[in-house]
């Protein structure tokens, strides 16, 4: 029924997924050494890793096992929703001599999330 | 002092690290299809990912950024303690014809944990 569908949709929305997160370097005190950009879209991962773990939750065998163990023993934590794919961004920063340096920073932007 | 040392050790012990977890396949209902072994040492990851993230917490640049953002905006979650290195185990299982098959299962055992 439509009611069941909306409940499912709401429940599904609570599952592990990528969320928007714009990081302004001035908010975290990095604007004194990062010249450009002034911030970037980092994203973050958040949400439930429920039993049983569905395929789209991009999990490992260990996460499947741990989720199963948690279902019979809650003292063992569920798997956690974390970045499973990350990409790089380029930034201009000031080195110790106040020189502007262009550097590629690895693993800065979340491209995908999963239960691990 | 010894008291301070034990407090530090206890606090340090709360940080993200690997914990023992023996999975007995009969406890999770897998003994009907897994022939051997009867269980295995899977380990699991658990603990805090505090600000600032120390080197030994094996984090990504994104985790460092997210931890920093969490320190100024608690609505963004901290990084999560998860397996960062996993290894395989071999298991004997029964296939659909009740034949015993030896298979290598990837990503079954936690070798290392980190904040992600």
């Amino acid at each position: 029924s439509p009611k069941h569908h909306s409940q499912r949709a709401r429940k599904k929305n609570k599952n592990c997924r990528r969320h928007s997160l714009y990081v302004d370097f001035s908010d975290v005190g990095w604007n004194d050494w990062i010249v450009a950009p002034p911030g970037y879209q980092a994203f973050y991962c958040h949400g439930d890793c429920p039993f049983p773990l569905a395929d789209h939750l991009n999990s490992t065998n260990h996460a499947i096992v741990q989720t199963l163990v948690n279902s019979v023993n809650s003292s063992i934590p569920k798997a956690c929703c974390v970045p499973t794919e990350l990409s790089a961004i380029s930034m201009l920063y000031l080195d110790e001599y106040d020189k502007v340096v262009l550097k590629n920073y690895q693993e800065m932007v979340v491209e995908g999330c999963g239960c691990r | 002092s010894p008291k301070h040392h034990s407090q530090r050790a206890r606090k340090k012990n709360k940080n993200c690290r690997r914990h023992s977890l023996y999975v007995d396949f009969s406890d999770v209902g897998w003994n009907d299809w897994i022939v051997a072994p009867p269980g295995y040492q899977a380990f699991y990851c658990h603990g805090d990912c505090p600000f600032p993230l120390a080197d030994h917490l094996n984090s990504t640049n994104h985790a460092i950024v997210q931890t920093l953002v969490n320190s100024v905006n608690s609505s963004i979650p901290k990084a999560c303690c998860v397996p960062t290195e996993l290894s395989a185990i071999s298991m004997l299982y029964l296939d659909e014809y009740d034949k015993v098959v030896l298979k290598n299962y990837q990503e079954m055992v936690v070798e290392g944990c980190g904040c992600r």
């Epitope: 010249v35 502007v100 262009l102 | -």
Partner: antibody, heavy 121, light 108 residues
């Protein structure tokens, strides 16, 4: 296209605070760094500082103790305050845009037409 | 800070001639982060060149920039009457951002 217009008093007394505003039209103030540059009569150019729409600033060290640059995104404006002025602060004051991307950061384009501020009693 | 020295202070040339303006930095300008501007009397500076050699939008191809490290050059291949002005270099490879003292190109 984007246009910048400086406004503010043309005469300021010594020891007082110089206040100027730059109004940006034709573009959102939220996508770039916004800068102030000055030019004493018959002399060269001096960068004062810049601001991002979030309020993040960077100032020229010799002026840092006297300079405040602020932004009002609702009005698409940014402002300069220079305290404890002397005759040496007499100059044409320009506002200008700096690209905030790594691929185009650092040069000034476009500029406002400039406003002359004289410090005199 | 990086000090930029422009030479000559004044360049007296006739229309149609070639103008060569020099900008020397007190230390190496990283990644050729150098720009050139033209300023006419009573007007704001106008961006000509960025990245040492890239022409800004709408700038005629008689203007060209070259150089790296500490030595940079702005060349105007054939001077037009509207090119007589003051030219400034600016570095953005180090903080603070700094300008040269300018070169005046005047009619001979």
């Amino acid at each position: 296209q984007v246009q910048l217009q400086e406004s503010g008093p043309g005469l300021v007394k010594p020891s007082e605070t110089l206040s100027l505003t730059c109004t940006v039209s034709g573009d959102s103030i939220s996508s770039y760094y916004w800068s102030w540059i000055r030019q004493p009569p018959g002399k060269g150019l001096e960068w004062i500082g810049y601001i991002y729409y979030s309020g993040s600033t960077r100032y020229n060290p010799p002026l840092k103790s006297r300079v405040t640059i602020s932004v009002d995104t609702s009005k698409n404006q940014f402002s300069l305050k220079l305290s404890s002025v002397t005759a040496a602060d007499t100059a044409v004051y320009y506002c200008a845009r700096i690209c905030s991307s790594t691929s185009c950061w650092g040069w000034f384009d476009p500029w406002g037409q400039g406003t002359l501020v004289t410090v005199s009693s | 800070e990086i000090v930029l020295t422009q030479s000559p202070g004044t360049l007296s040339l006739s229309p149609g001639e070639r103008a060569t303006l020099s900008c020397r930095a007190s230390q190496s300008v990283s990644s050729s982060y150098l720009a050139w501007y033209q300023q006419k009397p009573g007007q704001a500076p106008r961006l000509l060149i960025y990245g040492a050699s890239s022409r800004a939008t709408g700038i005629p191809d008689r203007f060209s920039g070259s150089g790296s490290g500490t030595d940079f050059t702005l060349t105007i291949s054939r001077l037009e009457p509207e090119d007589f002005a003051v030219y400034y270099c600016q570095q953005y490879g180090s903080s603070p951002l700094t300008f040269g003292g300018g070169t005046k190109v005047e009619i001979k």
